[in-house]
């Protein structure tokens, strides 16, 4: 890329070498921009996965791949048999976490994710195709949604088992790679500016340097560095009854993650299940899954079994019931 | 990304009436339980309204109980807040929230307390 990025001195082009290597040249640039800015842009990203161990069980991981803060995590399931959307755990960094039947334990995970184990029996448990959506809040940047349902192919009625552990190892192999490719994107855009930057001006073809160059200079390589050291996971536990579910467009999910659907469904409405006694999450655990959570200590603070998993300046009113709707 | 965006405020006499709307895009607006908010000038963030995802169950602050209604279009990712009886108490900024402030209490309110919010509408009651 070098070589041909300059033209010898001595040496005169070949005709339509000129043009083609300068635009190469030019462009090139501009497509590592383009993905060190995109790079930055907040993901959520969602996967349902059923227990191999345990058929009646799912497991479903949602993560914010983004620089900002969370400030509030909702977790929501359409429902059985085409009912309503529910909220099944709405967890907040100080203010503690709640949940609704079928959950039975949320919780952080890392401070960019967090899990919930559903009930594994019960009417209001999930189905295969139940959809469950994730929507983490990052204030005042905004929030973003993901939603996910288990992939047809592990259909607990089908007699092969499901095999999550591969799955799961191939998108975080995807989520590592393409984070990779843009942290090395990055870091050549650098290279080439400093490039443009210092070496003479080619005597055929003058180099210009974008008047953005140096921003993206200053920020864009941090912005994928960030992105690479978000690879956070949450988890969800659930049984199965039929569902039917139509698919609507996708709002947000890193397209690597391959593993499952992960879109939003806008569906028919029906009776919604209140669920009003909350079950109170347990004690926490620390993930060491690939050694991917190196920066554990960063998270929010855990406490023991209770609603209010963290302090609470305003005392015992916490600990009640909603007051509202629920 | 989630948006929420309110629209229907303005000024209005004392007893006359507004309605407020929410188009909401970005999200699964039939999964989650919306809400009305709102902060009078100079004061903090109170409670207004709340609607579950399937609009049969709604919650209201005393102070606009029979006054206002609290109602949500899951085919149009669309709430609603109609106010009547208006007073100079309900000038305030409202804001369309996706949440329930009840589930961690209404004590000290925040904007970040919410899954989503919008940037707000005003409404002005004075004659």
């Known amino acids: 890329m070098r070589t041909e990025a300059q033209v010898p001195a001595l040496q005169p082009p070949e005709p339509g070498l000129e043009g083609a290597m300068g635009h190469r040249t030019l462009v090139l640039p501009w497509v590592l921009l383009t993905l060190c800015v995109t790079a930055g842009t907040p993901e959520v990203w969602v996967q349902v996965r059923m227990e191999a161990t345990e058929l009646s069980s799912f497991t479903i991981r949602c993560g914010f791949l983004g620089s900002g803060s969370i400030s509030l995590v909702t977790v929501s399931w359409g429902g059985p048999n085409g009912a309503g959307g529910t909220t099944l755990a709405v967890l907040h960094p100080e203010r503690g976490i709640r949940q609704w039947a079928p959950a039975r334990q949320a919780r952080w995970e890392t401070q960019s994710s967090i899990s919930l184990i559903l009930e594994g029996s019960g009417a209001s448990s999930p189905c295969a195709n139940t959809t469950f959506c994730c929507k983490f809040a990052s204030f005042p940047e905004g929030s973003w949604e993901a939603c996910g349902s288990l992939p047809p192919s592990s259909d607990p009625g089908l007699s092969a088992p499901p095999t999550p552990a591969p799955i799961l190892r191939a998108d975080l192999a995807g989520i590592l790679g393409v984070s990779g490719v843009l942290l090395f994107g990055c870091v050549y855009l650098l290279h080439l500016l400093r490039r443009h930057k210092h070496r003479p001006a080619p005597r055929l073809q003058p180099s210009r340097t974008s008047p953005q160059a140096p921003r993206a200079r200053a920020w864009a390589p941090s912005q994928a560095s960030q992105a690479a050291l978000h690879v956070p996971y949450a988890t969800i536990n659930t049984s199965c009854r039929p569902a039917t579910l139509d698919t609507a467009h996708p709002h947000g999910g890193p397209s690597w993650w391959a593993s499952l659907p992960t879109h939003a469904a806008h569906r028919p409405q029906g009776p919604a299940a209140w669920a009003s006694t909350p079950i109170p999450a347990r004690g926490s655990f620390v993930s060491v899954e690939n050694g991917l959570y190196a920066q554990a200590g960063e998270r929010p603070p855990h406490t023991g079994p209770g609603l209010t998993l963290f302090p609470d300046p305003r005392g015992p009113r916490a600990m009640e019931g909603p007051l509202g709707v629920r | 990304e989630v948006q929420l965006v309110e629209s229907g405020g303005g000024l209005v006499q004392p007893g006359g009436s507004l309605r407020l709307s929410c188009a909401a895009s970005?999200?699964?607006?039939?999964?989650?339980?919306m809400s009305w908010v709102r902060q009078a000038p100079g004061k903090g963030l109170e409670w207004v309204s709340t609607?579950?995802?399937?609009?049969?169950?709604?919650s209201y602050v005393d102070s606009v109980k029979g006054r206002f209604t609290i109602s949500r279009d899951n085919s149009k990712n669309t709430l609603y807040l109609q106010m009547n009886s208006l007073r100079a108490e309900d000038t305030a900024v409202y804001y369309c929230?996706?949440?329930?402030?009840?589930?961690?209490?209404?004590?000290?309110?925040?904007?970040?307390?919410?899954?989503?919010w919008g940037q707000g509408t005003m409404v002005t009651v004075s004659s």
């Open positions: 970005g999200f699964t607006f039939s999964y989650y339980d």
């Open positions: 609607i579950n995802s399937d609009g049969g169950r709604t």
């Open positions: 929230v996706e949440g329930d402030p009840h589930n961690f209490g209404l004590e000290n309110l925040s904007l970040r307390d919410f899954g989503s």
